[in-house]
Interface confidence: low
């Protein structure tokens, strides 16, 4: 069994927790309610997951199939440049960064957008099937 970082590549484990969707080698949780960015992050962390970190355009395209025009918080912030919560830079997609206030990232079916972190939005958590099962 794998263990360790939430950000690692997951093994193809058989199932996801209740109300989570299995897609590829990960489990995704699409919220019904809305929270600000920080509260969304806390929600995910409390469930052994993290706010969605997208690894590449392929994953983004796959996920956008499940999204509407409503925006969802993801694990993306502008800290001296747009970075994912695992510390990696955003390097496969465009997002505008021309505001003091819009420093958190969200996604909808059309792509990535910046927003004020205080705005309540839906959110997406991501984790390996079964808690803490990440592959080194």
């Amino acid at each position: 069994l794998c263990q360790g970082s939430n950000y690692s590549t997951c093994a193809s484990c058989p199932s996801c927790p209740d109300r989570w969707m299995k897609y590829g080698n990960h489990c995704y949780y699409f919220s019904v309610e809305e929270k600000d960015w920080n509260s969304s992050l806390e929600f995910c962390l409390a469930r052994d997951s993290h706010l969605l970190v997208i690894t590449d355009n392929q994953e983004m395209s796959l996920l956008q199939v499940f999204l509407s025009e409503a925006f969802c918080w993801i694990g993306l912030r502008n800290n001296s440049g747009w970075r994912w919560e695992d510390g990696s830079p955003l390097n496969f997609s465009r997002i505008s960064s021309n505001s003091f206030v819009q420093t958190c990232g969200a996604i909808n079916k059309n792509g990535l957008q910046a927003s004020s972190c205080e705005v309540p939005l839906h959110w997406v958590c991501k984790k390996c099937p079964f808690a803490d099962q990440a592959l080194f």
């Epitope: 465009r94 505008s96 021309n98 505001s99 206030v101 819009q102 004020s116 205080e118």
Partner: antibody, heavy 119, light 107 residues
């Protein structure tokens, strides 16, 4: 529903200063920054600058760097723009507007304040 | 600074007719475009953001399209209440910049 209420018309002399106000109601004042836009009679729209009410940070366009000073009073949820060294070129309608959730477009506008600079 | 050009200052159309207002950016703006309607003596009103997303409460006869540098606002069945000036605005780069406006009139 967000509402932006601007101060009334002003008639001022050349060389003077004027302070326009924009009172916000109906939503969290500090969540979105407030923008100011100029429109001369029969002309288009020109961005002046914006202010982030949460911490008072401002950014002006190059053209208005020395012309406009933007401030906020969070206790009264009011944004202000002071225009300095007025000339006839500053005669215009000035709008305040709230920035949209997903970018610097402007989703709620005040009704506009008319400034006339004349001796 | 990105320049926004609305090639037509005036457009005439018949009531019930179709109107297309064009806007060209001097550089790519990646759909970071808004459209506003302004009637005389009033503040601008946001119609569309993100080049295509209609704001809540805006009639469905309005639509936005385009990509890259070229964008269009279309009114499919012109009503008397649509007589106004229309402005595009890019928000890909700071400063945000507006087009010069297109005034729509009845033919």
């Amino acid at each position: 529903q967000v509402h932006l209420q601007q101060s009334g018309p002003e008639l001022v002399k050349p060389g003077a200063s004027v302070k326009l106000s924009c009172k916000a109601s109906g939503d969290t004042f500090t969540t979105y920054d407030i923008t100011w836009v100029k429109q001369r009679p029969g002309q288009g729209l020109e961005w002046i600058g914006w202010i982030y009410p949460k911490d008072g940070r401002t950014q002006n366009s190059e053209k208005f760097k020395d012309k406009a000073t933007l401030t906020v009073d969070t206790s009264s949820t009011t944004a202000y723009m002071e225009l300095h060294s007025l000339t006839s070129e500053d005669s215009a309608v000035y709008f305040c507007a709230r920035r949209g959730q997903f970018g610097p477009y402007f989703d709620h506008w005040g009704q506009g304040s008319t400034l006339t600079v004349s001796s | 600074v990105i320049q926004m050009t609305q090639s037509s200052s005036f457009l005439s159309a018949s009531l019930g007719g179709r109107v297309s207002i064009t806007c060209r950016a001097s550089d790519h703006i990646y759909n970071w475009l808004a459209w506003y309607q302004q009637k005389p003596g009033n503040a601008p009103r946001l119609l569309i953001s993100g080049a295509t997303s209609l704001e809540t409460g805006i009639p469905s006869r309005f639509s936005g399209g385009g990509s890259g540098k070229d964008y269009t606002l279309t009114i499919i069945s012109l009503q008397t209440e649509d007589i106004a000036s229309y402005y595009c605005q890019q928000y890909w780069n700071t400063p945000p910049t507006f087009g010069g406006g297109t005034k729509v009139e009845i033919k």
